[in-house]
């Protein structure tokens, strides 16, 4: 009778992560006497899979009944394979021996790689605001995705970016990959609506890249441009003087109203107007009693933005002439006010 | 449910010999070995032998080659140890041991004394 | 045959801390062949690590193992009054099977 051939009909499988492998195997005879284990690797370190006999191996199953007598199908099914279950699995005949089997005939192994989708990409910016003109840094992450060949760009506002540098790591072979990516993107003061986009096309997804993204809201700190104007009379006596604080974001503002160096008011910036690029205007109003001043007084809008250091605006208010308008508030959106009486 | 249910407890006399059993049920009893497992009060486990169910194979601990036999009825679904010329060092608990050692019986326990 | 040596033989340790079992081999054991049991007075032995690292149906995350060729560990990393046991390492890498002494793991 011819030797017994252990046949592994299948060099190469592919399944996808989550997915039953399943690894054929028959033997050409049933002598010699003595069980089939699975191995994945060869020589002395190779893993035990499966032994019919002896073990646990709750993922997995035999494709037909080893316990029937005629029977020479020793093919496995694994259940729930990860990308740590890639690797080159094979068959093995033993012989009965004393004390242990003797390993008899092996057949020639079935490679079996594993398709893992990568995980959502994951957008991060800086720590901290950054004002239009500059240029940050925005990363983008995602892991164990297998095989290795992996697609990834950037966009601003549906526009590709160009400035980046990518990674998969590790460079040699692995279980499963991952890729970081670092891209430059310079502010303008438009961005605050921005959105920057990381795209991830792999073959797991058939054609349906994963994408994160990132605001820019949460990155750009965009500065305010004051103005001061004096309104006209209101009253004897009265004069209204306005800040006008445009274009600012993020929201957090405190306003601080010096008379001649000496605070008179401090308010935070509340009932806003928000313009359509989304930065704010906030207007603020200083009703001042000249007949309690003898001197010329020099009045400063004087405005914390975002924790940065303050900026501030003067106007010089002449109490020896007549009061009359000095200016106008031009800018139609600025209605938010917030008056207050100084005596 | 897999199930190994085991005789109960024996009391014999030193240098008689005892047949402890084991029934399985809720598997293919043919499948994989059964294992015999013993343990002295406050002590380890020691691993005695098994037997192959679908050919009667066995292999034994060197230390219990004179001492033990293991033998299957496979019509019962029943595996059996045999401890033969006992004395008080086989007092202990027997456990029977499905091959793939997640499943164990209740243990037999043997007391060797006059 | 393959000797194995648990130590320490016996310990205590309080809720919350991290606890580390050892087996050491005579020879080398193929990683895939290495069981640890756990064991409660008046109870048959549980497998509770298969294959040195994967734990058995049921077992707490808590609880990993690792080692390889003669030196492997079972590691509590957060002690709970239900892990108080004994636990038994096991190789079949080769004839005659054979179990550690044991640990008996008490709580404090």
């Known amino acids: 009778e011819e030797e017994l051939q252990v046949i592994q009909p299948d060099k190469s499988v592919l399944v996808a992560a989550g997915e039953t492998a399943t690894l054929r195997c028959t033997a050409t005879s049933l002598i010699p006497v003595g069980p089939i284990q699975w191995f994945r690797g060869a020589g002395p370190g190779r893993e035990l899979i499966y032994n019919q006999k002896e073990g646990h191996f709750p993922r997995v199953t035999t494709v037909s009944d080893l316990t029937k007598r005629n029977n020479m199908d020793f093919s496995i099914r694994i259940g729930n394979i990860t990308p740590a279950d890639a690797g080159t699995y094979y068959c093995v005949k033993f012989r009965k021996g004393s004390p242990d089997d003797v390993e008899f005939k092996s057949g020639a192994g079935t490679e079996l790689s594993v398709r893992a989708k990568p995980s959502a990409p994951v957008v991060s910016g800086p720590a901290a605001r950054a004002t239009p003109q500059h240029t940050v840094s925005f990363t983008c992450e995602s892991h164990g995705f297998s095989p290795r060949d992996i697609t990834l760009k950037w966009f601003k506002n549906g526009n590709e970016l160009s400035d980046f540098q990518t990674n998969v790591d590790p460079v040699g072979e692995s279980v499963s990959y991952s890729i970081h990516s670092t891209a430059k993107v310079v502010l303008t003061r438009e961005d605050v609506h921005s959105q920057v986009i990381c795209e991830v096309a792999h073959v797991t997804l058939q054609g349906d890249p994963l994408r994160g993204t990132a605001n820019l809201s949460e990155t750009i700190r965009v500065p305010p441009t004051l103005e001061v104007t004096q309104q006209p009379v209101r009253a004897e006596n009265q004069v209204n003087v306005t800040c006008q604080v445009r274009k600012f974001y993020p929201q957090r503002l405190q306003l601080t109203w010096l008379e001649n160096g000496n605070v008179s008011r401090t308010e935070t910036a509340s009932t806003v107007t928000e313009n359509k690029d989304g930065t704010y205007n906030w207007m603020s109003w200083l009703l001042v009693n000249v007949s309690a001043h003898r001197d010329d007084v020099k009045l400063t809008c004087q405005v914390e933005h975002d924790g940065q250091p303050a900026v501030s605006k003067s106007h010089d208010l002449k109490v020896s002439a007549h009061p009359k308008e000095q200016g106008s508030n031009t800018a139609a959106e600025n209605t938010g006010s917030n008056e207050r009486n100084i005596y | 449910e897999v199930q190994l249910q085991q005789s109960g407890a024996e009391l014999v006399k030193p240098g008689a010999s005892v047949k402890l059993s084991c029934t399985a049920s809720g598997f293919n009893f043919e499948d994989t070995y059964m294992h015999w497992v013993k343990q002295r009060p406050d002590q380890g486990l020691e691993w005695i032998g098994r037997i192959d169910p679908a050919d009667g194979d066995t292999k034994y601990n060197p230390k219990f080659q004179d001492k033990a036999t293991i033998t299957v009825d496979t019509s019962s679904n029943t595996a059996y140890l045999q401890l033969s010329s006992l004395t008080s060092e086989d007092t202990a608990v027997y456990y029977c041991?499905?091959?793939?050692?997640?499943?164990w019986g209740q243990g037999t326990t043997l007391t060797v004394s006059s | 045959q393959i000797v194995l040596i648990q130590s320490p033989a016996i310990m205590s340790a309080s809720p919350g801390e991290r606890v580390t079992l050892t087996c050491r081999a005579s020879?080398?054991?193929?990683?895939?062949?290495l069981y640890w049991y756990q064991q409660k007075p008046g109870s048959s032995p549980k497998l509770w690590i298969y294959s040195t690292s994967n734990l058995a149906s049921g077992v707490p995350a808590r609880f990993s193992g690792s080692g390889s060729g003669t030196s492997y560990s079972l590691t509590i990393s957060s002690m709970e009054a239900e892990d108080a046991a004994s636990y038994f390492c096991h190789q079949w890498y080769s004839y005659p099977r054979t179990f550690g002494g044991g640990t008996k793991l008490e709580i404090k």
């Open positions: 020879s080398s054991v193929s990683s895939s062949y």
């Open positions: 041991v499905r091959g793939n050692y997640v499943n």
